[in-house]
């Protein structure tokens, strides 16, 4: 007979998996918060800045109680992919003014990428249906001016901060229900 079968593959504790995802999200939230503050110090924002290509915030009211894990993870992954694309674009096309935010923008991009991989892993570990591959997004037009790049940076970092704050809330609550 062949070698004895190995021990059965133990499915990781979903609470522990979710916990490490929450901590990674909080860590990215801290980075985003710090970078947004740095941007405000260097280039004070006059009012709110928006960018049409950014995802709309996943939730605007106190409907956290109705959240389900598959929906939160799928939506969070989609939104963070969009933000990753926007951060990459900002680093490439944002202009010389935003070079002062390096290497922090690069670090943010790497950590965003790490969180996305963690979400992908969590979804497969929890046997959640994998979303279909994203259709190629239309390229983002370069900012019309240096100030346009700065306004875009305010919008991207502000939106990412709110998305991550919302994600932490949702994930923390879902963890208590597991």
């Amino acid at each position: 007979p062949g070698p004895p079968p190995g021990p059965p593959r133990v499915s990781p504790d979903p609470r522990a998996e979710l916990d490490s995802t929450v901590l990674l999200t909080r860590s990215l939230l801290a980075d985003t918060r710090q970078l947004a503050a740095q941007l405000r110090d260097k280039f004070p924002a006059d009012g709110d800045h928006n960018l049409d290509s950014l995802p709309t915030l996943a939730m605007s009211a106190g409907a956290l109680g109705a959240l389900q894990l598959p929906g939160v993870l799928t939506r969070l992954r989609a939104d963070l992919l969009s933000y990753l694309r926007h951060v990459q674009w900002l680093r490439r096309a944002g202009g010389s003014s935003l070079k002062t935010l390096e290497p922090e923008l690069g670090t943010l991009q790497a950590r965003l990428d790490r969180l996305l991989r963690r979400l992908q892993l969590l979804m497969s570990r929890l046997a959640l249906p994998q979303p279909p591959p994203d259709p190629p997004a239309p390229p983002l037009a370069p900012p019309s001016s240096a100030w346009g790049g700065i306004r875009a940076a305010h919008a991207i970092l502000g939106g990412l901060h709110l998305t991550l704050d919302w994600a932490v809330r949702g994930l923390l609550l879902l963890k208590t229900r597991l």
Epitope: L24, R26, S27, M59, L64, W166, T176
Partner: antibody
């Protein structure tokens, strides 16, 4: 100067509700979350919940879920905490405190609002 | 919920002496490069005041005689040389998980 100013002391009957306000000044209200903390006589501090001024979406300590309601009025830079179905154990000082979910410590506190529940 | 236990419950020292306050968590509160423990000072009739955040970072405006250390489950607040205004109650708080909780406090009294 960064400040959180809370509404005055309240005396309530058991079963009633109380709504406490917390007016923020000296910083951009939407840049931080608002948390609420209870301090009953002789008890440790107890976190009630947290709200993001931009998106709402409060989260609560399970112990207070269903009885505490956190809201904000962005235009007035004011946060509110309502506590319903009051009982004698709710007699305490309630604080609002500025926080954020990344590290979740409280760097600015209101002066506290004393709520007395007595028949 | 994570339970924080502070010791001693009270401590009587003289101005100029060194104070060492302990906070023990029922499970590790350190992860992802952070130790999620914070320290506050509270005087009678006043709101708590943040002293130390993330175990060892001194809050702006807090005197350098205050310092924090520790990781995992054991944390310490040290006051290197006590001043009259340091006699108060000190609380630790964790923010590792929902809900954040506080220790029961250590009352620092003048000997």
């Amino acid at each position: 100067e960064v400040q959180l100013v809370q509404s005055g002391a309240e005396v309530k009957k058991p079963g009633a509700s109380v709504k406490i306000s917390c007016k923020a000044s000296g910083y951009t209200f939407r840049d931080y979350n608002m948390d609420w903390v209870k301090q009953a006589p002789g008890q440790r501090l107890e976190w009630i919940g947290d709200i993001n001024p931009t998106i709402g979406a409060p989260i609560y300590n399970q112990k207070f879920t269903g009885r505490a309601t956190l809201t904000v009025d962005k235009s007035a830079s004011t946060a509110y905490m309502e506590l319903s179905s009051l009982r004698s154990e709710d007699t305490a000082v309630y604080y609002c405190a500025r926080g954020e979910l990344a590290h979740w410590y409280f760097d600015v506190w209101g002066q506290g609002t004393t709520v007395t529940v007595s028949s | 919920d994570i339970v924080l236990t502070q010791s001693p419950a009270s401590l009587a020292l003289s101005p100029g002496e060194r104070a060492t306050l302990s906070c023990r968590a029922s499970k590790s509160v350190s992860t992802e490069g952070y130790s999620y423990i914070h320290w506050y000072q509270q005087k009678p009739g006043q709101a708590p005041r943040l002293l130390i955040y993330l175990a060892s970072n001194l809050e702006s405006g807090v005197p350098a005689r205050f310092s924090g250390s520790g990781s995992g489950t054991d944390f310490t607040l040290t006051i290197s040389s006590l001043e009259e205004e340091d006699f108060a109650t000190y609380y630790c708080q964790h923010s590792r998980d929902l809900p954040p909780t506080f220790g029961q406090g250590t009352k620092l009294e003048i000997k």
